[in-house]
């Protein structure tokens, strides 16, 4: 299926991205609470099934998309269910600051997709 | 108040382009994309694709692959699509929207602007 | 592309009779799905987005839910001002895409 034209956003942007609305922040979303993902099973997509449900939060929204593109690039993305541990709620900020540790282990280890 | 703004109507000849512009206002112009939606005739919703203002970043719909053109003006806080090579079936209302409350969940749009393609 | 599967096309029922529309997706897209009413001339509005959550002013007999694939949108009571064609939005995947509509009139 078609992917949407656009240049995917690269990691470096993506980690760029979360330490930009990390840094110096306590909390995140009003301290809103998502699901504890696996970034394991597809980071991405898993990231972005616990983040899309967070709405009213205009920090995160570019995050988000960033996200969404870089899950849409993915063979049949759409069709991946991430581990998610519907007994464990996180706030987003940790969701977040968990991302962003992962991502930059694949990053340093260049493993980019 | 939320407020987008769109240009007049445009009548053009095949093989043309037009560009349509989204002047918006009540809020911080570089917080939200603008997104751009046409809808032809009688026809449904299809998306075109957003612009970042904020970055300048980018998503195409495929549809419309190298024919649109995604601009923003930080300084007049108007957004700007482009879409040339225009054939009948780019007669629409082409209409400009941002999302606030949910990422990419267009909420404020603006009143529509037809282009009508003829010789 | 994520295709979206709006059913039926057309409807027409009486004033305060329950309208529904159902929406499915060719994919799962979990909650990431909206609702819009558009009337002639006029753009679209939001009523519902992410599944179930009511847009600011959208009165209490307009509701959404499902999961997944499958989707729902519910009028409890029809009112002569709802007379429109509503649209749903998948907005999980880009590209973005919408449903091809529901015309809903009234008897």
């Known amino acids: 299926s078609p992917s949407p034209v656009t240049p995917s956003p690269t990691l470096k942007e993506l980690i760029e991205e979360l330490v930009n609305i990390t840094q110096n922040q306590a909390s995140l979303c009003n301290g809103s609470m998502v699901w504890s993902v696996n970034l394991t099973a597809g980071m991405y997509c898993a990231a972005l099934e616990s983040l899309i449900n967070v709405s009213d939060c205009s920090a995160i929204q570019r995050t988000q998309r960033m996200l969404k593109a870089l899950c849409s690039q993915k063979p049949a993305a759409g069709q991946i269910s991430s581990e998610r541990s519907r007994d464990t709620k996180i706030e987003v900020i940790q969701l977040v600051k968990n991302l962003l540790t992962y991502v930059r282990g694949v990053y340093r280890h260049g493993n980019f997709r | 108040e939320v407020q987008l703004v769109q240009s007049g109507a445009e009548v053009v000849k095949p093989g043309a382009s037009v560009k349509v512009s989204c002047k918006t206002s009540g809020y911080s112009f570089t917080d939200y994309p603008i997104y751009w939606v046409r809808q032809a005739p009688g026809a449904g919703l299809e998306w075109i694709g957003y612009i970042d203002p904020y970055n300048g970043g980018t998503t195409y719909n495929q549809n419309f692959k190298d024919r649109v053109t995604l601009t923003a003006d930080k300084s007049t806080s108007t957004a700007y699509m482009e879409l040339s090579s225009l054939r009948a079936g780019d007669i629409a209302v082409y209409y400009c929207?941002?999302?606030?409350?949910?990422?990419?969940?267009?909420?404020?749009w603006g009143q529509g602007t037809l282009v009508t393609v003829s010789s | 592309e994520i295709v979206m599967t709006q059913s039926p096309a057309s409807l027409s029922l009486s004033q305060e009779e329950r309208v529904t529309i159902t929406c499915r997706a060719s994919q799962n897209v979990r909650n990431a799905l909206a609702w819009y009413q558009q009337k002639p001339g006029q753009a679209p509005k939001l009523l519902i987005y992410l599944t179930s959550n009511r847009y600011t002013g959208v009165p209490s007999r307009f509701s959404g839910s499902g999961s997944g694939t499958d989707f729902t949108f519910t009028i409890s009571s029809l009112e002569p001002e709802d007379v429109a064609v509503y649209y749903c939005l998948q907005h999980w995947n880009y590209p973005l895409t919408f449903g091809a509509g529901t015309k809903v009139e009234l008897k």
């Open positions: 929207a941002t999302a606030v409350v949910a990422t990419d969940v267009m909420e404020n």
